[in-house]
């Protein structure tokens, strides 16, 4: 603007405006006149860049024409007031309508005086995330995947997780002419250690106040890990029965456990009870080789353990309590 | 081609008053803003005000407000400038000119032939 | 009350090149105040020449162009023709009147 006291006038407006797609949106246009300046505004005009003539006028003895009756209107100035608004309404917006409009004031004695009006054309996009369930394959597949319809212009995607990984983001042409949809996929090698850690998927548009965040809860598909716990080395003959866990991590849930030794079925001083193994007192020593075998949709894996119930002075020991 | 045409000179007594006429021909006269200006004997130039032909809308020079009004009749395309309470310092040659706009801004474009007004007793 | 000032006369040779001043009591003439320019020969009506400062009015030849020149407005004739030979008024805009300079009687001799 020019510095106060130049006693001339000026046209205000932003240098951008959004609207978006299909709505309605009005381009801001004032004429600022100093206290002590006499001005006469005889005409408003609005034009576009690049195309001759005008698409609306307001003329002081006349009132408004438009190039297009329907899609525009003068919000303010009326027949018979001081032109000091020239605000102009445009209603369903198309994407064509985007670009640069010069707003002019054709003021007496001052002359004419003009602004450029930069029209956004926005579409909001709706965004969605959905894992993509994943198998155990050895190499990077994509394990989530986050879409941005229809956003004008495109939404800006990124992922964001502590396990590493890699976008891939496509664009493809929107279902209304001139936006935009965002694909991304989140890729990475898939692991039991992954499945069921989240990751987010961050989308930024014009449109959005602040950035939408869409978690993820990944899903790996894998066969039983298994493990026996319960042994402490330090079992004695003479103690109170003791407990076997077979722990098994798998997705989907394991559907069997079976117990065994390496010399075929269990003997009898070991009782399976679903995941556990029930170890009964014994009277003499024993060396045997335990056996769990865990099955799920995708296969089965098993566990061993070497179990040894030794002699020795029962105050010494610390696993198996005595009777 | 864009023409102002002023009435004769007139003669008045102080205190009466006098109408001069301006009229357009040649341009869209609704679309128009006219200023009056004189020119005393021996003086410079001094302007009185300026009317917007569409509206009727003017301006006025503070000294001349209260005794000039301007108007104009569209039909006939024709501006009038009335002063009144006339005294002998009005004596002077009355010029209408219309405004025309070169580039992005206006200009003192083309001026009547003058109208001489004598105020004497 | 605002003052606008021009030099009474100046004399330029057929074709050279001559400028003409325009000084306002205020203070340094800015292009808020819409430096207008008008000529008036002898026996015939005023004729605009330049608007805003700088803008030559239409069928104005281009010698006479318009400007500020330091804290006047300025107009310069170069290659002055002897039908150039007129009175020159400035006419400055103080936000809600005209006022008139003396005039510049020129003279190409």
């Known amino acids: 603007w020019p510095p106060p006291g130049t006693g001339d006038v000026v046209v205000q407006a932003p240098t951008q405006v959004p609207g978006f797609l299909g709505d309605s949106v009005t381009l801001p246009c004032y004429l600022q006149v100093p206290n002590m300046e006499v001005t006469h505004v005889s005409q408003l005009t609005w034009a576009r860049h690049g195309e001759s003539g005008s698409m609306a006028v307001f003329h002081q003895t006349q009132g408004p024409s438009y190039s297009e009756s329907k899609r525009l209107e003068f919000v303010a100035a009326r027949l018979g007031a001081e032109l000091r608004n020239a605000s102009l309404r445009m209603f369903g917006l198309r994407v064509e309508d985007e670009g640069n409009y010069t707003c002019l004031f054709v003021t007496f004695p001052q002359g004419s005086r003009s602004v450029d009006i930069w029209l956004r054309v926005l579409a909001k996009p709706q965004n969605t995330a959905e894992v993509q369930k994943v198998q155990l394959t050895g190499e990077p597949v994509p394990m989530a995947r986050c879409v941005s319809t229809g956003g004008r212009p495109p939404a800006q995607i990124t992922w964001h997780s502590d396990l590493g990984g890699m976008p891939n983001t496509s664009q493809v042409p929107g279902f209304l002419s001139g936006t935009v949809t965002v694909t991304s996929l989140w890729i990475l090698v898939p692991s039991s250690q992954v499945d069921g850690k989240n990751v987010t998927c961050k989308v930024e548009h014009e449109s959005f106040e602040k950035p939408q965040l869409l978690t993820v809860n990944l899903t790996v598909y894998y066969p039983p890990e298994v493990s026996i716990s319960g042994y402490d080395n330090n079992w004695y003959l003479g103690q109170n029965e003791a407990t076997l866990t077979c722990d098994a991590r798998s997705n989907p849930e394991p559907t069997g456990y079976n117990w065994s030794t390496t010399m075929g079925p269990l003997p009898p001083f070991a009782v399976a009870q679903g995941a556990q193994l029930l170890i009964r007192p014994v009277d003499k020593p024993i060396n045997t080789t335990l056996i769990c075998n865990v099955t799920n949709a995708l296969g089965a894996r098993q566990a061993e353990l070497t179990v040894q119930v030794k002699e020795g002075p029962p105050s010494e020991h610390s696993g198996i309590s005595r009777n | 081609q864009v023409q102002l045409v002023q009435s004769g000179a007139e003669v008045k007594k102080p205190g009466a008053s006098v109408k001069v006429s301006c009229k357009a021909s040649g341009y869209t006269f609704t679309s128009s803003y006219i200023s009056w200006v004189r020119q005393a004997p021996g003086q410079g130039l001094e302007w009185i005000a300026w009317i917007y032909a569409g509206t009727g809308d003017t301006n006025y020079n503070q000294k001349f407000t209260g005794r000039v009004t301007m108007t104009t009749d569209t039909s006939t395309s024709t501006a009038y400038m009335e002063l009144r309470s006339l005294r002998s310092d009005d004596t002077a040659v009355y010029y209408c000119?219309?405004?025309?706009?070169?580039?992005?801004?206006?200009?003192?474009?083309?001026w009547g032939q003058g109208t001489t007004v004598t105020v004497s007793s | 009350q605002a003052v606008v000032t021009q030099e009474p006369s100046l004399t330029v040779s057929p074709g050279g090149t001559v400028t003409l001043t325009c000084r306002s009591s205020t203070g340094a003439v800015t292009t808020s105040n819409l430096a207008n320019w008008v000529q008036q020969k002898p026996g015939q009506a005023f004729r605009g020449l330049i608007g805003?400062?700088?803008n030559r009015a239409p069928g104005v030849p281009a010698r006479f162009s318009g400007s500020l020149l330091g804290d006047k407005a300025a107009l310069t004739l170069s290659g002055a023709q002897p039908e150039d030979e007129a009175e020159y008024y400035c006419i400055l805009w103080y936000s809600n009147k005209f006022v008139f300079g003396g005039g510049t009687k020129l003279t190409v001799l």
């Open positions: 805003h400062t700088n």
């Open positions: 000119a219309r405004h025309g706009m070169t580039g992005r801004g206006w200009y003192f474009a083309v």
